[in-house]
């Protein structure tokens, strides 16, 4: 058992142009708070996956209101450490996710609004009981400076907090409330007692009686922020205007130690204490080898050309990052066309196509009517992944399979008699009326209400039956042509239909894998 501790030193705009002036939106003042999430070293860094090692939320920081035309400062932060207790062994390798959240205090309907301002994610190797490790991370235009450490809680000790011990003065038998003594390994010293009054938040000690300050704090008890400290004992050139020494840049400013190394000043220089797996003047050299399996998600580890160069990871499809730790949302690129549904199956991308489309990316338009012929001479009309049948006269229903009585709707006007016919219907008009539906009256003088028809088409003309016969032949020819067209389309699209069925089968198998 033990506690992971995180101290946020500063959060503010990063260097360079385009840095934000304020963390608050235009809606008014806001305040910051932090969330820390710890995951075991081999877990995915997806923020949604559980923080298996634990998580903690800071208190809200002071309210920040942007001063017009003022430079964006380091922002007011919540007080105190973020502490994440862990119950089991400390894993050594872990993912550290620090989120900076903004609480907007303007007139929000339903109370304050929260939004994620920045997230930094680091994979780290860290032994419990070691010194504070310092880090600077950038998240977009923001910069976060922080320190962290893992410490065991008695009776647990060791770099993984797995050994149990008792203080040297303790009796050998277990007292009430203590763990069984069986797994005890040698006697252990209690953690050092810091100098009396040493700040619990800004100071720490590795030897009894000392008080070492975290970055940004000074004074014998680490109570004084560097920016407002007195003139005594500070480095840098003398200020002629105040008679005080102005703080100058120290060798550890900006933390020259990479990869979570902690910096300590030496006369005229600095020294980095590197976490396990790194070495070099600035902890810039990775001591991790491919045999340690540093590439996540099955990534291929390739050693550098010489012993001092770092490994590289060749990631499987769907992963990226220097350690293949980040899942790529390949569906965000919208690879599926024609409204297909994208499925990222990890190692493969699949598109589930809408009706009427097929192919790996739904790129083939399957002619909606293929394989769905309309019966009885009906013609198929495509549209938006669906189809409908325009039925020949005498037939109805979705696929023109239902026989319809064309005379049921009494289509012949003015008392005309309706006769059903395979090509449609024929109206026998009452005297005085003419037209396909007997809709036109014939005037007594023999002139119709329409422009005069050619003599051969006058009402009652004996050639009328012949004209109907010609129309019937033409209709039959058209119907035959449509049938031939439908059959040829059917054949042409059969291969895409098969491809679509095969694709869906594969997708079903992979989703069940």
């Amino acid at each position: 058992a033990g506690v992971f501790e995180l101290q946020i030193h500063s959060f503010g705009p990063g260097p360079g142009p385009g840095a934000p002036r304020s963390p608050c939106s235009a809606r008014g003042p806001c305040r910051l708070f932090f969330r820390v999430c710890l995951k075991p070293g081999l877990s995915e860094e997806a923020a949604e996956s559980p923080c298996a090692l634990g998580a903690a939320l800071s208190a809200r920081g002071p309210v920040y209101t942007e001063q017009p035309e003022a430079p964006a400062p380091d922002l007011p932060l919540p007080n105190g450490l973020l502490q994440v207790p862990f119950r089991d062994a400390w894993p050594g390798t872990f993912s550290l996710i620090i989120e900076t959240w903004r609480e907007e205090l303007g007139d929000q309907i339903g109370g304050p609004a929260w939004s994620l301002l920045a997230r930094v994610t680091r994979r780290r190797r860290l032994a419990a009981g070691g010194p504070w490790a310092r880090d600077i991370q950038r998240a977009g235009a923001w910069e976060l400076r922080f320190s962290y450490r893992a410490r065991c809680e008695l009776p647990a000790v060791g770099t993984a907090c797995t050994r149990l011990c008792r203080p040297r003065s303790a009796p050998s038998r277990c007292g009430p409330g203590l763990r069984p003594c069986a797994p005890l390994e040698d006697e252990c010293e209690a953690p050092p007692v810091c100098r009396a009054g040493c700040s619990l938040e800004h100071g720490f000690c590795e030897q009894p009686g000392e008080c070492r300050c975290l970055e940004g704090w000074t004074g014998p008890l680490c109570m004084v922020p560097v920016s407002t400290s007195s003139c005594l004992g500070l480095r840098g050139p003398s200020s002629t205007t105040t008679g005080c020494l102005v703080p100058g840049p120290g060798p550890c400013d900006g933390n020259p130690c990479a990869n979570g190394g902690s910096c300590s000043e030496t006369p005229g220089s600095f020294e980095c204490t590197c976490p396990r797996g790194f070495y070099g003047l600035r902890c810039e050299v990775s001591g991790v080898t491919c045999a340690d399996g540093p590439c996540f998600n099955g990534g291929l580890c390739v050693g550098g050309a010489d012993p001092d160069s770092a490994y590289i990871c060749h990631c499987p499809p769907g992963f990226q990052g220097s350690n293949c730790e980040k899942r790529v949302d390949r569906c965000s690129l919208q690879p599926c066309r024609n409204g297909g549904l994208c499925l990222d199956l990890g190692h493969a991308l699949r598109c589930r196509c809408r009706a009427g489309f097929a192919g790996p990316r739904c790129e083939h338009d399957l002619d909606d009517c293929a394989g769905r012929a309309c019966a009885n001479g009906g013609t198929c009309v495509e549209g938006g992944g669906a189809h409908r049948c325009s039925c020949a006269l005498g037939f109805g229903g979705r696929n023109c399979r239902e026989r319809a009585d064309p005379c049921a709707a009494r289509p012949c006007a003015h008392g005309g008699r309706c006769y059903a016919h395979f090509s449609g219907l024929v109206c026998a008009c009452a005297p005085g009326y003419m037209g396909a539906r007997c809709e036109f009256p014939v005037h007594p003088d023999g002139v119709s209400a329409l422009p005069a028809a050619p003599p051969g088409l006058r009402p009652g003309d004996p050639q009328r039956a012949g004209v109907i016969a010609v129309i019937v032949v033409v209709v039959i020819a058209i119907v035959a042509g449509i049938v031939v067209l439908v059959i040829s389309r059917k054949k042409r699209m059969a291969k895409y239909e098969k491809a679509e069925i095969k694709e869906m089968g594969e997708m079903h198998r992979e989703l069940n894998a």
Partner: antibody, heavy 117, light 107 residues
Framework: EVQLVESGGGLVKPGGSLRLSCAAS????????MNWVRQAPEKGLEWVGQ??????????HYAESVKGRFTISREDSKNTVYLQMNSLKTEDTAVYYC????????WGQGTTVTVSS | NIQMTQSPSSLSASVGDRVTITCKAS??????VSWYQQKPGKSPKLLIY???NRYTGVPSRFSGSGSGTDFTLTISSLQPEDFATYYC?????????FGGGTKVEIK
């Protein structure tokens, strides 16, 4: 030096069972995906199955040809991965290799499984 | 599953020859192709990953190229220790699949 050593191969009758082991050394075993790949006599390579890490809940994946018959498991504390083969068929006769990662970077020397009546 | 078709299935060559082996995927696999070398009675060894990257310790005479569906392994100057069987494998789509192999023999 990285070493993967397979064992447990032998002659078995159709319908029988066999358990192969692969012991790893020289690597942080718990950080590696492990696979079994087989090679039938005078034939090419065929991926059999895979087991991932504790953090992936030891997820397993299998080739269609062995699904439901073969089971992969691992014991990180012993640096060992296993292939339990049940309902063996003559077409399962092959040299079985264990190999690491998604890209099969480290390989063992193989163990021979013969299924014959 | 994606099919990998390797050609030729075997070839005879002399020391110093330039040898080219091709592999064709049944669908686009990007550059997720690896090449392996296997000597008789031994296990395969990774030579090339990501279609064109030499794996650690692989001599520079081995090179790979290609993307999409067509891939090539080239041995610029064949050495005595290169006589072996070579396999291509695709890693774009799960499950990984291999070509049938190309046996490089001494002429």
């Amino acid at each position: 030096e990285v070493q993967l050593v397979e064992s447990g191969g032998g002659l078995v009758k159709p319908g029988g069972s066999l358990r192969l082991s692969c012991a790893a050394s020289g690597i942080t075993f718990s950080n590696f995906w492990m696979n079994w790949v087989r090679q039938a006599p005078e034939k090419g390579l065929e991926w059999v199955g895979q087991i991932r890490l504790k953090s992936d809940d030891y997820a397993t994946h299998y080739a269609e040809s062995v699904k439901g018959r073969f089971t992969i498991s691992r014991e990180d504390s012993k640096n060992t991965v296993y292939l339990q083969m049940n309902s063996l068929k003559t077409e399962d006769t092959a040299v079985y290799y264990c190999t690491t990662g998604y890209y099969f970077d480290y390989w063992g020397q193989g163990t021979t499984v013969t299924v014959s009546s | 599953n994606i099919q990998m078709t390797q050609s030729p299935s075997s070839l005879s060559a002399s020391v110093g020859d330039r040898v080219t082996i091709t592999c064709k995927a049944s669908e686009n696999v990007g550059t997720y192709v690896s090449w392996y070398q296997q000597k008789p009675g031994k296990s395969p060894k990774l030579l090339i990953y990501g279609a064109s990257n030499r794996y650690t310790g692989v001599p520079s005479r081995f090179s790979g190229s290609g993307s999409g569906t067509d891939f090539t392994l080239t041995i610029s100057s064949l050495q005595p220790e290169d006589f072996a069987t070579y396999y291509c494998g695709q890693f774009y789509s799960f499950p990984s699949t291999f070509g049938g192999g190309t046996k490089v023999e001494i002429k």
